[in-house]
């Protein structure tokens, strides 16, 4: 008789990342008997939900169920039926919902309640939806990349799992750029973290980590663009805004009501003598860079050193993984290679921004114009944020690694979030037998 293969003893978990611009569903899988080991969880699926972020459904909450259907049905297909009832589902909402909550707690609660109602009606073990803090977002991103890079493992490996991996236990810093916020998280070198709000203490796999983190709300790429437009329209002499961050020949009409809809532009709000204005691109990197720098207040710092807006930032230390929009934008611009210096990146951006809009549209015919039009701004913003905001230099630039995936799993906060909520990161180094669940972070 033939030997029947035993059914594999695996577990699954689902995390939905409800970002400001869109929602993505991630499915993770791991061997059931190895859940305390480091590096065993891997992503088996990513499903991008069609449509905007959940905060945009505030006036149409009844459409949330339909919005989530395709990706939740995909999860039903990918995960074996026998596992559905045991598969935890988590939804974490980030800065888009933080901003909505700032405007109206009641509206944010309504959106989350309806999201929960939709997700509760699937045959998984739904654990609830919540708005995660910026500190959590930074911390979980840091946990994700270091977990995937094997930095928490005590076993030194003879092989390298990623091209830029140094075979030591020094953790990577995490740089995360979203649409509405950006996070910087790393272990500083023997440096006191001067502001308690930015300090995290972890004990993971038997080792203590003192981690610095900060999330800059309104400094994600989309909200930074709204900020820049709101700042620049203040000094425009009429309803034409000649904008160096858009390609020459590019034109777009913006409603003033849309500009002032977000809490991020409140500080620039003023009564304008027009309801609409037209952006006219002039495509000049240097001027764009200068305009972006005006969003960073570097004149005030109550600490030994700051990033911007009076926020403490210790001296940068070690290698950094830059992911999410840091990666997507730089990948589009073909600037993710380890060999590309900061000077070369700047040169490429100068050339790219100066290219006429008609030429850009022809060269990238398959890309949606809304996204295509914003790469000059986004690329320039990334450089400004990393160099002037976080104080990377031409020399330390080589320590930034633009990462999309590690070992097939997306870099981002979702894996770290799930590892924590499912108690899969033990405080102590696991013995050969699994530990009790009492010592988890």
């Amino acid at each position: 008789t033939q030997n029947k293969a035993l059914p594999e003893n695996v577990k699954y978990g689902i995390v939905l990342d409800a970002g400001s611009s869109h929602t993505s569903l991630y499915i993770y899988k791991w061997p059931a008997e190895k859940e305390n080991d480091t590096g065993v969880v891997h992503q088996v699926e990513e499903c991008r939900v069609k449509g905007p972020g959940i905060s945009k459904f505030v006036q149409k909450v009844n459409e949330i169920g339909i919005y989530l259907t395709d990706c939740m049905e995909r999860a039903r297909e990918v995960i074996p039926r026998s596992q559905h009832q045991e598969t935890p589902v988590y939804l974490g909402a980030t800065a888009g919902m933080r901003l909505l909550r700032m405007e109206s707690e009641e509206l944010a609660d309504r959106v989350l309640d309806v999201v929960e109602r939709s997700l509760s009606n699937y045959p998984f073990d739904f654990q609830g939806a919540r708005i995660i803090t910026g500190q959590e977002e930074g911390a979980y991103g840091w946990i994700t990349i270091n977990y995937l890079l094997g930095k928490f493992s005590q076993k030194t490996r003879w092989f390298s799992i990623v091209p830029y991996e140094t075979n030591n236990q020094e953790t990577f810093g995490a740089l995360d750029l979203g649409g509405a916020s950006t996070q910087v998280t790393f272990v500083p070198q023997n440096q006191t973290i001067e502001s308690p709000d930015n300090a995290l203490q972890f004990r993971l796999y038997g080792k203590d980590y003192n981690v610095y983190t900060h999330s800059f709300l309104c400094y994600g790429k989309d909200q930074a663009l709204w900020q820049k437009l709101a700042k620049d329209i203040q000094v425009a002499s009429n309803e034409i805004l000649r904008d160096p961050c858009f390609h020459p020949g590019y034109k777009k009409v913006v409603n003033v009501s849309d500009l002032y809809k977000t809490p991020c532009t409140k500080r620039f709000e003023m009564t304008l003598p027009f309801q609409q204005f037209e952006i006219q691109g002039i495509g000049n990197y240097q001027q764009c860079h200068q305009s972006i720098l005006e969003l960073f207040n570097t004149s005030y710092c109550p600490y030994s050193q700051c990033a911007f807006n009076g926020i403490f930032l210790p001296p940068l230390q070690g290698d950094f993984g830059a992911f999410s929009a840091f990666y997507f934008v730089m990948k589009f611009l073909n600037l993710t290679s380890e060999k590309v210096s900061q000077e070369k990146v700047t040169e490429m951006m100068k050339k790219f921004c100066a290219q006429p809009w008609e030429e850009i549209k022809t060269s990238y015919a398959g890309v949606k114009e809304k996204y295509l039009s914003e790469y000059c701004f986004s690329g320039t913003y990334i450089l400004s944020l990393l160099l002037q905001g976080y104080h990377f230099t031409a020399d330390s630039w080589e320590h930034i690694h633009f990462i999309g995936k590690i070992q097939g799993s997306d870099a981002g906060w979702t894996l770290g979030y799930m590892l924590n909520l499912t108690n899969m990161i033990p405080a102590e180094q696991p013995l050969s037998t699994p530990l009790s669940h009492s010592t988890y972070v």
């Epitope: 609660d109 309504r110 989350l112 309640d113 309806v114 929960e116 109602r117 997700l119 509760s120 009606n121 699937y122 045959p123 739904f126 654990q127 609830g128």
Partner: antibody, heavy 119, light 107 residues
Framework: QVQLVESGGGVVQPGGSLRLSCVVS????????VHWVRQAPGKGLEWLAV???????DYNAAFMSRLAISKDNSKNTVYLELNSLRLDDTAVYYC?????????????WGQGTTVTVSS | DIVMTQSQKFMSTSVGDRVSITCKAS??????VAWYQQKPGQSPKLLIY???YRYSGVPDRFTGSGSGTDFTLTISNMQSEDLADYFC?????????FGGGTKLEIK
């Protein structure tokens, strides 16, 4: 263990009002939603309203103008206010807990409270 | 509103029988259907959700099937304690609606 206990039923005249209460134990109203469902004598079940964990509400449009659902988390109590009562509102009124966080099917029901509308 | 129709109001059965109770939705409800059991003088008890997932503690003689508009609750080996009313419920859209119920009786 999970329990829901309804009260507030009784005999009421047409056109009158009533406030039903549902006291819950074994779970918290900040973690689960609660629905109200009614069952007329010898009839099927009819869904009335839900209040979700953050306080959002939804109603059966057929009753919307005559119903109000609310809750007091500190008292572990959900309320259903019924106005302009009619003879055909005579029924057993149940509160029921969402089986999952905010789902629309129910794993625990109260024993029901009887409302009789009679002139 | 979505109408849930349980065409058989009563069904006569014997202990040991295989019993199938059907429920038809007036429009597509996917698999967003639950089944409840209600004994006289008691409140309903959840048996099945998502059309075919057995709720914890429910004996495995109860199975649910179907999707779209046609749904079935099957009791594979009828027991005397299963004599009760059975209701289907759709939760695909508001208002939530229930079938009229099917009462199982002994032949």
């Amino acid at each position: 263990q999970v329990q829901l206990v309804e009260s507030g039923g009784g005999v009421v005249q047409p056109g009158g009002s009533l406030r039903l209460s549902c006291v819950v134990s074994g779970f918290t109203l900040t973690n689960y939603g609660v629905h109200w469902v009614r069952q007329a004598p010898g009839k099927g079940l009819e869904w009335l309203a839900v209040i979700l964990r953050r306080g959002s509400t939804d109603y059966n449009a057929a009753f919307m103008s005559r119903l109000a659902i609310s809750k007091d988390n500190s008292k572990n109590t959900v309320y259903l206010e019924l106005n302009s009562l009619r003879l055909d509102d005579t029924a057993v009124y149940y509160c029921a807990k969402t089986a999952v966080v905010a789902g629309d099917y129910f794993d625990y029901w109260g024993q029901g409270t009887t409302v009789t509308v009679s002139s | 509103d979505i109408v849930m129709t349980q065409s058989q109001k009563f069904m006569s059965t014997s202990v040991g029988d295989r019993v199938s109770i059907t429920c038809k939705a007036s429009q597509n409800v996917g698999t967003n259907v639950a089944w409840y059991q209600q004994k006289p003088g008691q409140s309903p008890k959840l048996l099945i959700y998502s059309a075919s997932y057995r709720y914890s503690g429910v004996p495995d003689r109860f199975t649910g099937s179907g999707s779209g508009t046609d749904f079935t609750l099957t009791i594979s080996n009828m027991q005397s304690e299963d004599l009760a009313d059975y209701f289907c419920q759709q939760y695909n859209s508001y208002p939530l609606t229930f079938g009229g119920g099917t009462k199982l009786e002994i032949k």
